[in-house]
């Protein structure tokens, strides 16, 4: 429970307003009012406050609002979201792009990963999908932060939007992410013709089935060694090494690079020795010639 | 269901000493501001004072000022109106009511306790 | 303090018209802060509107509010039986708290 002390008159608090930053922590406590501080939120971030001041500002926002801020209150905290935790934002119904733009300028700068992933999934559900606007606001305010949201927000991403994103902005996004992304992509740049499909769907390629890999591969792509080690293992592992010599192009000799890493190391596991002898790049650890190979998944699978 | 229920009206003598009660249920009086707002006979609302649930800040109007006091027990959910020298501008029906943060309006009152200072 | 003053005094109608009633602050308030009650003779307030426009919980759509800055009105569109009654604003963006000195809606 919180320690209660009197407000002395002198010190009563009728504006928030720069003298407030002489006041100390238990003076701020006993005569700053929650509602008179919410209701005047918009003159708070001009206040130099001490980061101890903050955290006291804080919890009269916490008292006044344990159900979670109202954006009126959210869209002027200033440097005071730097004091929130994701358990705070997680409360919080955000719908104005005003508002997230706001809070993302003053995030910069700071370890704030974790409340910036929340804020975005808060906006998100808040305006119902990530709309064009919304994917807009996090490309020119937040590179990167598309890969934020979990892949069930991604999943109302509608294909429409797809375009406008950058291959920056999927630089942080694991295979889930992309899993739920590459789909769209596909549908969005379908029309496309093969050198210019290739350019746009790369970035999401992380999310690609084993079928349009070996689609790709027909399409004399000349897949850069960057994108390959992005795609799912399970999606390059079914490649026969003819398929990844096309598929590479050029850039196949970088598979000896690469060779201890995943996914070329699993790839070259499951390849015959003689078959990647024809590389002539001298990968070794393939299946030596003569021996049989067993995929024992299938047998268990219909067993 | 919300309910309050105030307490501790009377008759009571210029300078003399009243204390109200307003019992809470139906709600996280905890995590509630509540108000106190008088009426006198024949005349409008008057805002007299509020709580905050947590640190207990109070504000008051500045015709109450230094004489009454409004406090709470959170253990109790209770609210209380301590007010002193009374004099006979003080009559008047006192409500307790609870103050609504997110609509930012007074949302629930009590019935209301008539305070009668007179000699 | 912020001082607001209502208007008309009283307001004589019959049921099924129009009621509009006023309410002026000394200083802009913003919107979010501006509460409207209803009192009937012998009862404690209750909340009609909050945030100048949005209706509370089980307030018929015939009230109404609007306005911004310094003016805000409250409207009835067409008066029942049970509307006639004393309507007070209320600010809450600086203490104290005030509230006008109410319109009396009456029967004509």
């Known amino acids: 429970d919180v320690e209660r002390t009197t407000c002395p008159p002198e010190k009563e608090v009728h504006e928030i307003d720069e003298s407030l930053i002489f006041y100390k922590k238990r003076e701020l406590e006993a005569c700053v009012d929650a509602a008179l501080l919410a209701a005047q939120m918009d003159r708070v971030d001009a206040i130099p406050f001490t980061y101890e001041q903050l955290d006291v500002l804080k919890h009269k926002l916490d008292e006044l609002y344990p159900q979670g801020y109202p954006e009126s209150v959210i869209r002027h905290l200033g440097h005071l979201f730097l004091k929130m935790s994701p358990e705070d934002i997680r409360k919080w119904n955000v719908t104005s792009l005003e508002t997230l733009k706001a809070l993302l300028k003053v995030s910069k700068g700071h370890e704030m990963s974790a409340q910036v992933a929340t804020l975005i999934d808060r906006v998100v559900v808040g305006r119902g999908q990530l709309d064009k606007d919304t994917a807009d606001t996090l490309t020119a305010f937040c590179p990167g932060c598309l890969c934020s949201l979990s892949p069930e927000r991604l999943s109302s991403v509608p294909p429409s939007i797809i375009g406008a994103v950058r291959p920056q902005d999927l630089d942080t996004c694991g295979p889930r992410q992309l899993d739920v992304l590459y789909p769209k992509a596909r549908l969005a740049f379908q029309n496309m013709s093969g050198s210019e499909y290739f350019v746009k769907i790369r970035p999401f390629l992380g999310g690609a089935p084993t079928e349009d890999l070996k689609a790709l591969s027909q399409q004399n792509v000349s897949m850069d060694l960057a994108t390959f080690m992005k795609l799912r293992r399970e999606a390059v592992l079914p490649l026969s090494v003819a398929e990844v010599q096309k598929l590479l192009g050029p850039h196949v000799e970088g598979l000896k690079v690469e060779e201890q890493h995943s996914p070329v190391r699993d790839w070259i596991l499951k390849q015959r020795q003689d078959d990647l002898d024809t590389l002539g790049l001298g990968l070794q650890g393939g299946i030596p010639n003569g021996y049989l190979i067993l995929d024992l998944s299938v047998r268990e699978a219909l067993s | 269901e919300v309910q309050l229920l105030e307490s501790g009206g009377g008759l009571v003598q210029p300078g003399g000493s009243l204390r109200l009660s307003c019992a809470a249920s139906?709600?996280?009086?905890?995590?509630?501001?509540m108000s106190w707002v008088r009426q006198a006979p024949g005349k409008g609302l008057e805002w007299v004072s509020n709580?905050?649930?947590?640190?207990?800040?109070?504000n008051y109007a500045d015709s109450v000022k230094g004489r009454f006091t409004i406090s709470r027990d959170n253990s109790k959910n209770t609210l209380y109106l301590q007010m002193n020298s009374l004099r006979a501008e003080d009559t008047a029906v006192y409500y307790c009511?609870?103050?609504?943060?997110?609509?930012?309006?007074?949302?629930?009152w009590g019935q209301g306790t008539l305070v009668t200072v007179s000699s | 303090e912020i001082v607001l003053t209502q208007s008309p005094g009283t307001l004589s109608l019959s049921p099924g018209e129009r009621a509009t009633l006023s309410c002026r602050a000394s200083?802009?308030?913003?919107?979010?802060?501006l509460a409207w009650y209803q009192q009937k003779p012998g009862q404690a307030p209750r909340l009609l509107i909050y945030g100048a426009s949005s209706r509370a919980t089980g307030i018929p759509d015939r009230f109404s509010g609007s306005g911004s800055g310094t003016d805000f009105t409250l409207t009835i569109s067409r008066l029942e039986p049970e509307d006639f009654a004393v309507y007070y604003c209320?600010?809450?963006?600086?203490?104290?708290?005030?509230f006008g000195q109410g319109t009396k809606v009456e029967i004509k």
């Open positions: 209320q600010q809450a963006l600086g203490y104290p708290h005030t």
């Open positions: 139906g709600f996280t009086f905890t995590q509630t501001y």
């Open positions: 709580i905050s649930p947590t640190y207990s800040t109070t």
């Open positions: 200083q802009s308030v913003s919107s979010s802060y």
């Open positions: 009511a609870r103050y609504n943060a997110y609509q930012i309006g007074l949302d629930y």
